[in-house]
Interface confidence: low
């Protein structure tokens, strides 16, 4: 029988009446157009909704937008368009919401052609009030808040000027001209690239990388011959043109650009690209594109300095610069990532790593599924996950994989079961152990979301027809109840729940269509009465993450330690609550060779935990570039995995000697870097 339809499924008592009392409809007095929704702050209940409608006239497009505000998680909305003087808001800039619980919001208005600059509306009280401010420039990008101080904003102008505000957009100052890209770093630092000659495009590969740590009072040039730059975790990366040809290399800095080291990664040509797939304070996943229009490349993982890299995964699917990759961080379990590879036969397969890129494997076939036509052997196959690439190919996949840090172990994704990803209509699968095992959760494509830290999963069928039914599960997707939330079906456009998965409210968005008009409508359902009581100690059970062999003393050891979590029992129907904190108990493991990556010049043969010297480097001195000096590496082939906490056990020796020689790096060495003040 289909999931959720067998006899073992207990029904939630009287749920129809409970949900009916907690279902709130809001019909927006709007023609359909487009709608965008933003949550303002965390646990505030404040939602802003911007609807826009374009009327194409003979010579121009006339636009109209409305702004609505809710302070009860979407149950009721108030039209606050008058607070922004009924101005048409530019949706391409979205609503710029301030970090944390600052309560700050910036909306960018559409202005008439001849105006001197743009116009913004600013709020610092969770959109209760707005102040209109005329800008001395036309913005090219959305206002960017400093992560450290929400009063500090930066924006690029259509004239490529870098503008900064120190008082939340009240007053603006142009701190630099000819700027291509600008980003906030830590401690209110701004990094940006500048061009000298024609334009950003013309000077690509000849840009300069600048830094200001005092909002534009003084500057330091920290790099030349720059193609692009990026920030990830505590690392600053720059791709730099080589002197002699059109290739470029990655350089990395961990001190805000004062000193640089050349990353031990392959150089790339004009048509290739680098991409930071994921980064934290410990390490980086870097994709290096293969030459030619192959659509794939190689994933490398870094050491703790971002300099020495190990090959992690070959034939990694990544179509073009800024194109599609399925790389997904499974946030519900430490060390887990999922992505796709392009196999030799041109089919796409899903791979998963549980140890931060150390080893990759196929996803285990779900117990309750059979292999499809892509499988050569009908009894042996794997689960393959649909992510960004499938969505870009317009497959019947409404959502990417979903996981939440506070819903420990839960991963939900569309997939197919075979030897490769299938274009047939996918089903929805769930894992409750971070991707080790999977179960078919729902037949056919669905939208899905996690509420109450995993206590409730909500789903809506993906259909071209109007819908009026929502499905929910209180036992991590084993059993499903259906609730008809309206008599009149709506054309569904999206599910919205507060980011962080702590809420018990879900908003169903869509539009109604009648002969004469169509209107936006939302239904907000509060599940608080379904989970009648607060969870108690007896509702939780101890779960060892990454457990694959309970007999083994080292069972659950990943990156040098194991973690036991308190997890809600599937049979418990209770509220984790908004203040729920994941309870975990870590314990350190003994070191084994699995806790070490292969050092520069070494590699791991398949199915072997030992690192052996690369044949082409045998007998050579291992020398590499570090902080602009050449270093000599004495190693027996191992280095500790970044973030690995193991102690004792195996302890390979590693020593680095300074060769006291300058590297022939293309980068500015620190002593050549210049500073200037405004």
């Amino acid at each position: 029988s289909a999931p959720g339809e067998d006899e073992e499924c207990g029904r939630v008592r009287d749920f129809v009446a409970k949900l009916a009392n907690n279902t709130h409809q809001h019909v927006f007095d709007d023609l359909r157009g487009s709608v965008s929704l933003s949550w303002v702050g965390d646990s505030t209940g404040v939602i802003l909704v911007l609807t826009t409608f374009h009327v194409p006239l003979v010579i121009m497009t006339f636009g109209q937008s409305k702004l609505y505000r809710s302070e009860d998680y979407g149950k009721n909305f108030k039209d606050i368009t008058d607070l922004i003087n009924n101005t048409f808001i530019r949706t391409e800039f979205g609503m710029a919401i301030g970090p944390e619980n600052s309560g700050k919001v910036v909306l960018t208005a559409e202005v008439s052609g001849g105006s001197r600059g743009g116009r913004i509306f600013r709020s610092s009280d969770f959109a209760k009030n707005f102040v209109q401010t005329d800008l001395p420039f036309h913005p090219l990008t959305q206002m960017m808040y400093s992560p450290q101080n929400s009063d500090y904003l930066l924006a690029l102008s259509t004239e490529n000027g870098l503008w900064v505000s120190k008082n939340f957009g009240g007053k603006w100052e142009e701190i630099h001209k000819a700027v291509c890209l600008a980003k906030w770093g830590s401690d209110n630092t701004i990094f940006f690239t500048t061009y000298a000659n024609g334009s950003c495009k013309a000077d690509l590969g000849a840009l300069e990388l600048w830094r200001t740590s005092d909002l534009g009072k003084s500057f330091k040039t920290i790099g030349v011959k720059i193609y692009s730059f990026g920030l990830g975790g505590r690392f600053l990366f720059a791709s730099v043109m080589a002197d002699k040809d059109t290739t470029r290399r990655i350089h990395v800095s961990t001190d805000q650009g004062d000193t640089w080291s050349m990353a031990q990664l392959p150089s790339v040509g004009q048509e290739q690209f680098y991409s930071i797939l994921a980064a934290n304070d410990d390490m980086v996943f870097m994709h290096v594109d293969e030459p030619g229009d192959t659509g794939f490349g190689t994933i490398f993982t870094s050491d703790d300095r971002g300099i020495v890299y190990s090959k992690s995964l070959d034939r990694h699917l990544y179509t073009t610069t800024g194109g599609e990759t399925d790389f997904t961080n499974v946030t519900s379990l430490r060390g887990v990532y999922i992505t796709s590879v392009l196999s030799e036969d041109n089919s796409i397969q899903t791979m998963i790593t549980f140890d931060q890129g150390g080893r990759w494997t196929h996803l285990r076939k779900p117990e309750n599924s059979e292999c499809d036509a892509t499988a050569k052997n009908k009894n042996e196959c794997s689960l393959h996950i649909h992510a960004s690439y499938s969505i870009s190919q317009k497959l019947n996949v409404p959502m990417a994989p979903l996981s939440e840090p506070n819903a420990v172990g839960i991963v939900i994704a569309h997939g197919s079961v075979g030897d490769a990803i299938s274009v047939m209509v996918p089903d929805v699968y769930i894992s409750d152990d971070g991707g080790y095992s999977w179960t078919k959760m729902l037949e056919g494509p669905h939208y899905y979301t996690i509420l109450d830290s995993g206590g409730i999963i909500v789903a809506i069928e993906h259909s071209s027809r109007p819908i009026n039914v929502i499905k929910f599960s209180t036992d991590e997707g084993q059993c499903w109840q259906t609730y008809t939330f309206t008599r009149d079906p709506i054309y569904f456009t999206g599910l919205a729940s507060e980011p962080g998965a702590r809420s018990m409210n879900i908003s169903i968005w869509g539009f109604t269509e009648s002969f004469l008009t169509s209107q936006w409508v939302s239904y907000t359902i509060d599940f608080k009465d379904i989970l009648e009581r607060n969870c108690e100690e007896k509702d939780y059970t101890i779960w060892l993450a990454h457990s694959t062999d309970p007999e083994d003393y080292e069972d659950g050891c990943i990156l040098g330690y194991k973690e036991q979590f308190l997890r809600l029992r599937k049979s418990s129907v209770c509220q984790n609550g908004r203040d729920y904190v994941v309870t975990k108990q870590p314990s350190i493991c003994l070191c084994s060779l699995e806790d070490f990556l292969c050092d520069f010049g070494y590699y791991r043969p398949e199915n072997d935990s030992k690192c052996v010297e690369q044949p082409e480097l045998k007998g050579h001195d291992l020398e590499f570039c570090l902080y602009g000096r050449e270093e000599h590496l004495t190693t027996n082939g191992y280095r500790k995995i970044p973030g690995d906490k193991c102690q004792g056990g195996v302890n390979p020796v590693r020593e680095v000697k300074d060769l006291k020689k300058k590297c022939t790096s293309n980068f500015l060495s620190p002593e050549k870097q210049n500073s200037k003040s405004n």
């Epitope: 041109n346 089919s347 796409i348 036509a373 190919q393 990803i421 047939m424 056919g444």
Partner: antibody
Framework: QVQLVQSGAEVKKPGASVKVSCKAS????????MSWVRQAPGQGLEWMGI????????SYAQRFQGRVTMTRDTSTSTVYMELSSLRSEDTAVYYC??????????????????????WGQGTTVTVSS | EIVMTQSPATLSVSPGERATLSCRAS??????LAWYQQKPGQAPRLLIY???TRATGIPARFSGSGSGTEFTLTISSLQSEDFAVYYC?????????FGGGTKVEIK
């Protein structure tokens, strides 16, 4: 085992319609497209169209557009092909064939094709006045 | 639509010899190509898919190669049961189209 069983031979007059059935067994019916292919006496194979058993969506070859209708009944795992306004040149053996139809999403820039891996025994349709 | 052209129309080969059949597409079909074998009075049987992968249960003497517009089916050592008509078929763009077929007969 996996098999497709088609309905029996038909003799029709010009202008009439014929409906051929194809019953699938031994696999999950909703996981595979079904193609229809015909073969006139002494001629080669000609693809007519394809039906997706889940939604029932179809794609027909241009030359059959307007005359052919492909449907499915998931409760009986059966696919049907109806051809109307028959003429003598429609005399042929009609085959249904399980078609993973590019079931392996290939990347990038093309699909991966698995071929029509299971065929029905064929249904002979004779159009004669 | 994509036109598939097979050559030769007829191939006379002695048992035990090698047979090479060609299929050309009017535009690139990438590797979205299949080969079928059909014997008189029977339904076609899938031999090769994805241009080069043997279908389940197909003997190793059958091999497919090519990509884009030029494809080849090779039967390394003809057995008596291999004398039949062979069709190529593309599935790059709808409508799927077949080649006219190559008849492999006993010399």
């Amino acid at each position: 085992q996996v098999q497709l069983v088609q309905s029996g031979a038909e003799v029709k007059k010009p202008g009439a319609s014929v409906k051929v059935s194809c019953k699938a067994s031994g696999y999950t019916f909703t996981k595979y497209y079904m193609s229809w292919v015909r073969q006139a006496p002494g001629q080669g194979l000609e693809w007519m169209g394809i039906v997706n058993p889940i939604g029932g969506s179809t794609s027909y070859a241009q030359r059959f557009q307007g005359r052919v209708t492909m449907t499915r009944d998931t409760s009986t795992s059966t696919v049907y092909m109806e051809l109307s306004s028959l003429r003598s040149e429609d005399t042929a053996v009609y085959y249904c064939a399980r078609d993973p139809s590019g079931i392996g999403l290939a990347g990038p820039f093309s699909r991966y094709y698995y071929g029509m891996d299971v065929w029905g025994q064929g249904t002979t349709v004779t159009v004669s006045s | 639509e994509i036109v598939m052209t097979q050559s030769p129309a007829t191939l006379s080969v002695s048992p035990g010899e090698r047979a090479t059949l060609s299929c050309r597409a009017s535009q690139s079909v990438s590797s979205n190509l299949a080969w079928y074998q059909q014997k008189p009075g029977q339904a076609p049987r899938l031999l090769i898919y994805g241009a080069s992968t043997r279908a389940t249960g197909i003997p190793a003497r059958f091999s497919g190669s090519g990509s884009g517009t030029e494809f080849t089916l090779t039967i390394s050592s003809l057995q008596s049961e291999d004398f039949a008509v062979y069709y190529c078929q593309q599935a790059r763009l709808g409508p799927w189209t077949f080649g006219g077929g190559t008849k492999v007969e006993i010399k």
